[in-house]
């Protein structure tokens, strides 16, 4: 399954929108900084097959979409930017979904890398718990916004590797 070029463009658009969503200076939130343990090894496109990489990408985007679809998120961000950002993520999910469905239909498809899926899920658990502990404060959301920009950048790199594999 070949991810369309528009998928990468969508990812870049999502990153731009996320950058625009920043409301407060990151420097005023330095005390709230947190290491969420982004599982960078899961974004090494050389370590597993394309099908597995697409499943990991899908999980990453789906968890990001869910995170920014909560009521707490709606209260934290400018509505029109949040809606545009969610729309970009949704489009990416559709592209990735079509790819995964295509691969699921092929009997020779290897088992999915369940530990990679779990690593992504645990990463977002840490983010969720951080927001809960910080009571969804503006600075907590700013820290999370910066972190998601970082994770989306990693997923953009993974997509580049995947396209080279085509």
């Amino acid at each position: 399954c070949d991810l369309p070029q528009t998928h990468s463009l969508g990812n870049r658009r999502a990153l731009i929108l996320l950058a625009q969503m920043g409301r407060i200076s990151p420097f005023s939130c330095l005390k709230d900084r947190h290491d969420f343990g982004l599982p960078q090894e899961e974004f090494d496109g050389n370590q597993f097959q394309k099908t597995q990489a697409i499943s990991v990408l899908h999980e990453m985007i789906q968890q990001t979409f869910n995170l920014f679809s909560t009521e707490d998120s709606s209260a934290a961000w400018e509505q029109s930017l949040l809606e545009k950002f969610s729309t970009e993520l949704y489009q990416q999910l559709n592209n990735l979904e079509a790819c995964v469905i295509q691969e699921v239909g092929m009997e020779e498809t290897p088992l999915m890398n369940e530990d990679s899926i779990l690593a992504v899920r645990k990463y977002f658990q840490r983010i969720t718990l951080y927001l809960t502990e910080k009571k969804y404060s503006p600075c907590a959301w700013e820290v999370v916004r910066a972190e998601i920009m970082r994770s989306l950048s990693f997923s953009t790199n993974l997509q580049k590797i995947l396209r080279r594999k085509d």
Epitope: S55, H58, V100, L118, R121, Q125, T132
Partner: antibody, heavy 119, light 108 residues
Amino acid sequence: QVQLVQSGAEVKKPGASVKVSCKASGYTFTNYWMHWVRQAPGQGLEWMGEINPSHGRTIYAQKFQGRVTMTRDTSTSTVYMELSSLRSEDTAVYYCARGGLGPAWFAYWGQGTLVTVSS
Amino acid sequence: EIVLTQSPATLSLSPGERATLSCSAGSSVDSSYLYWYQQKPGQAPRLLIYSTSNLASGIPARFSGSGSGTDFTLTISSLEPEDFAVYYCHQWSSYPFTFGQGTKLEIK
């Protein structure tokens, strides 16, 4: 509000298969993995596996690999769990439970479906 | 597979008393992925505590959780009649996800 409604009780003979359904409502069906957990009479809870309704990928517990098949129908927001080669030890209440994160992990359960395997 | 062992298997106490339920993991479990559920006869399990010590929505403050590594505890500070049920600890730190065998809390 989130609701998971399961199909009714089943009685099956050893060696047969059973297919239990779980219809979801009150949230975007494709956004959350759905899990299956079973409970034999008077026993504890046992995780069987999960399915991502968005694309249909599954992760099964090794114990059930080869005997369990989880599928979904996005048009009806329903997930299915089929267990084959049934034996008496498979007599249990089967639950679907929605995944999520933080306080949403297994916060929503179906009412359970009793499957009885008896000759 | 991470085996969760709960103790005691049965705990007999009276309303108003303090209940302490233990969950011991066969290997270390990150506290973020350790949960507690309550189950009453004929009902589905109900989420009580997530990530070791956080109270789920609608759960009374008399319930609390603690622990780390391989030892986790659920405490009910003063038992109410509706608290008598079976309690399960659960981990999703690694596949396959597992549950403890349960602790039955019964009226003395």
